[in-house]
């Protein structure tokens, strides 16, 4: 994909209850299986139909999972991350990073791409400042009439 793609990054705590067939999703990533360049984090690659994650509705394909039951997922081998989920118990708390594309343009496969995004405040602060300056200038102009 050409050009820079910017992302709106948000974090969320998702509590899942393990269903009859488990948690119901697949992951990619790890120190031995980087999915995003320069990032060995763990990403959701698939949400299985009618699984616990799908029925809950909050976890999305492409989300980065930061921790499981408070345990950080940094610098883990892929299989070690898988085992962590499998041994996480009945009630599983996930700290998740959602990334939404905010720039217009073609949406491509996010894997192996540039993980850098811009937080929302970096977008909103300049917009807000410009709005305030414009409003102030308009009021000054009206007073001079």
């Amino acid at each position: 994909m050409n050009g820079r793609v910017d992302y709106l990054v948000t974090e969320e705590e998702i509590n899942l209850t393990r269903g009859p067939s488990g948690l119901g999703f697949n992951i990619v990533g790890g120190t031995d299986q980087q999915y995003v360049s320069n990032d060995s984090g763990i990403y959701v690659s698939r949400i299985k139909e009618n699984g616990a994650a799908a029925l809950d509705g909050r976890l999305q394909e492409g989300d980065k999972i930061l921790s499981v039951n408070g345990q950080d997922l940094k610098n883990l081998l892929h299989q070690d991350a898988v085992d962590l989920f499998r041994n996480a118990g009945y009630a599983v708390s996930l700290r998740v990073q959602h990334r939404l594309q905010v720039q217009n343009g073609p949406i491509g496969h996010r894997g192996e791409g540039d993980p850098s995004g811009i937080p929302i405040f970096m977008v909103l602060v300049p917009v807000f400042a410009l709005t305030m300056v414009a409003a102030w200038a308009f009021m000054r102009y009206r007073q001079q009439l």
Epitope: L23, F25, N26, V28, Q33, V44
Partner: nanobody, 127 residues
């Protein structure tokens, strides 16, 4: 997502060998666990073999153990099924399947629901 295309099927005599290939498009192939299934006319789909994303783990159905060998070449985006000592009961359409990523649940490579991408199949006939 990747697309899967099988090749290498054909007609072979009992005791002979065939090598099936499953070529995947797309650069994400190395994240996929891959499997082979088969379906004979009037029968249910049957698990043949599977291989992990890294190639470190392989799995086989009881009916093919010791005769079939699965392998993969991530540089060529291809998974192979070497079939030796073929029997007439191996006659079927052979399907390649892929699962994007590793399930965080108990893994059953013989469960078709584990796989999210399927090829169109290649016919193998053993006379």
């Amino acid at each position: 997502d990747v697309q899967l295309v099988e090749s290498g099927g054909g007609l072979v005599q009992a005791g002979g060998s065939l090598r099936l290939s499953c070529a995947a498009s797309g650069r994400t192939f190395r994240y996929y666990s891959m499997g082979w299934f088969r379906q004979a006319p009037g029968k249910e789909r049957e698990f043949v073999s599977a291989i992990s994303w890294s190639g470190d783990s392989t799995y086989y159905g009881d009916s093919v153990k010791g005769r079939f060998t699965i392998s993969r070449d991530n540089a060529k985006n291809t998974v192979y099924l070497q079939m030796d000592s073929l029997k007439p009961e191996d006659t079927a359409v052979y399907y390649c399947a892929g699962a994007f990523g590793s399930t965080v649940d108990n893994y059953d490579p013989s469960d078709p629901r584990e796989y999210d991408t399927w090829g169109q199949g290649t016919q193998v006939t053993v006379s």
